[in-house]
Amino acid sequence: SSCGQVKCRKGEQCVHTASGPRCFCPSPRDCESGCASSPCQHGGSCHPQRQPPYYSCQCAPPFSGSRCELYTAPPSTPPATCLSQYCADKARDGVCDEACNSHACQWDGGDCSLTMENPWANCSSPLPCWDYINNQCDELCNTVECLFDNFECQGNSKTCKYDKYCADHFKDNHCDQGCNSEECGWDGLDCAADQPENLAEGTLVIVVLMPPEQLLQDARSFLRALGTLLHTNLRIKRDSQGELMVYPYYGEKSAAMKKQRMTRRSLPGEQEQEVAGSKVFLEIDNRQCVQDSDHCFKNTDAAAALLASHAIQGTLSYPLVSVVSESLTPERTQ
């Protein structure tokens, strides 16, 4: 029904009021619910109303506003503290101590975060986004700088339907359409071989505690596991000779290691050349990501930070030790 310039929607009635014509819903069941569009953000609950906008939001603190879109910092939240002396003693010893695995303790001095002391350094959200990895979408953290809210705003729960099959056939140069989806890693780009690559700027340099021969043997699973976390595709970079950039890694000469070596009566130089793992250089290829998503990494900085965030959560399935994003062509250095 309509009254004058006001167009009322299905099921609504026009009511003439002192302030002019208004639409009114006599029975909310018969009208389009304003809640249908899920207007309430940040976990707010939506309640249908009889008058425009036909919903009201009950917001969860610290949010307010008609759509719970406003963040209000609690008036006197004390800054998170670190178990000062305990964690000072444990920081940067190469092992993650859960009691120190907090933002206030720089994630145990980087020990829990692949040596990156602040993965959220570029995140300017008013929310402490590291505390909002909570299996629900927090739009204020849903930016690349804030690591896309750990991909919690785009159906993070989707799992690959034929996971075992798709893992076995990932990146095998044969297109399996049943695996050609974001959650299945786009079949390792097997179905996009004819499309031009879309490389993110930079290189991910990862140290993993697997010798090069073992890592290369397991490369498809390794790339699939990391690609799943980053919601894109990865590949091992090749050097100017076309060789895969996977090099033996001989371990950090950390204070803890030096101290440990001194406690062993070992021969001078013993163990110095023992392979501790691999240093692998990875590129991000967004050719499929950009078609299916607007959450793609244009450069490797935030991708490295997201891997560090997964290390903090303990959700890495490989023994990664460190991750760095390199912008320039890397030299082959240890």
Partner: antibody
Framework: EVQLVESGGGLVQPGGSLRLSCAAS????????MSWVRQAPGKGLEWVSY????????YYADSVKGRFTISADTSKNTAYLQMNSLRAEDTAVYYC???????????????WGQGTLVTVSA | DIQMTQSPSSLSASVGDRVTITCRAS??????LAWYQQKPGKAPKLLIY???IRASGVPSRFSGSGSGTDFTLTISSLQPEDFATYYC?????????FGQGTKVEIK
């Protein structure tokens, strides 16, 4: 199959020394932390020391600090516990146990050795 | 150091019984708590980690719950092979500490 085998236990006099070994197999040794846990006869379990072979980070219980030294040789896939200034109260079965979470010390011990008995007595 | 207190120290039960063992920490250990089973002359065996996750190969009759300071291990239907000593252990703050153990005996 992941396996841990301890050796080096025995009878020693108070003030003496002993070195225990824990040979690991079936997994990438440097990727997982290793602890020594002891159990005095008829008593409960007591954590003694921890090492992360990759970084060499070490942790000790106060009761053994300064007397025991934990180390690891990644080329031999073996962890060691050097025990000096031994006391009667150090008498126990000593177990080595692997921590389940890569570089995370805050993880449960998922694989245990069979234990080696250390007796400190005059 | 964090003190871990188990109760009861021992209990007698019959096959098929539901058994509950509790463990209390002197301060919060969040969910960084494990339960181990030990039989005489044998090494401990991991049953539960992160307070409620069953270790690989552990029967579903074993379950864990709790977080913070109060934890529970439940055996829904006691089997003959379950008669053993059970230990809780916190691995949140070093030194890692164990409860004193709960001996489950045949009634």
């Amino acid at each position: 199959e992941v396996q841990l085998v301890e050796s080096g236990g025995g009878l020693v006099q108070p003030g003496g020394s002993l070195r225990l070994s824990c040979a690991a197999s079936g997994y990438t040794f440097s990727s997982y932390g290793m602890s020594w846990v002891r159990q005095a006869p008829g008593k409960g379990l007591e954590w003694v020391s921890y090492i992360y072979p990759y970084s060499g980070a070490t942790y000790y219980a106060d009761s053994v600090k300064g007397r025991f030294t934990i180390s690891a040789d990644t080329s031999k896939n073996t962890a060691y516990l050097q025990m000096n200034s031994l006391r009667a109260e150090d008498t126990a079965v000593y177990y080595c146990a692997r921590h389940s979470g890569y570089y995370r010390i805050s993880s449960a011990m998922d694989v245990w050795g069979q234990g080696t008995l250390v007796t400190v007595s005059a | 150091d964090i003190q871990m207190t188990q109760s009861p120290s021992s209990l007698s039960a019959s096959v098929g019984d539901r058994v509950t063992i509790t463990c209390r920490a002197s301060q919060s250990v969040r969910s960084f708590l494990a339960w181990y089973q030990q039989k005489p002359g044998k090494a401990p065996k991991l049953l539960i980690y992160r307070a409620s996750i069953r270790a690989s190969g552990v029967p579903s009759r074993f379950s864990g719950s709790g977080s913070g300071t109060d934890f529970t291990l439940t055996i829904s239907s006691l089997q003959p092979e379950d008669f053993a000593t059970y230990y809780c252990q916190q691995y949140y703050i070093s030194p890692w500490t164990f409860g004193q153990g709960t001996k489950v005996e045949i009634k």
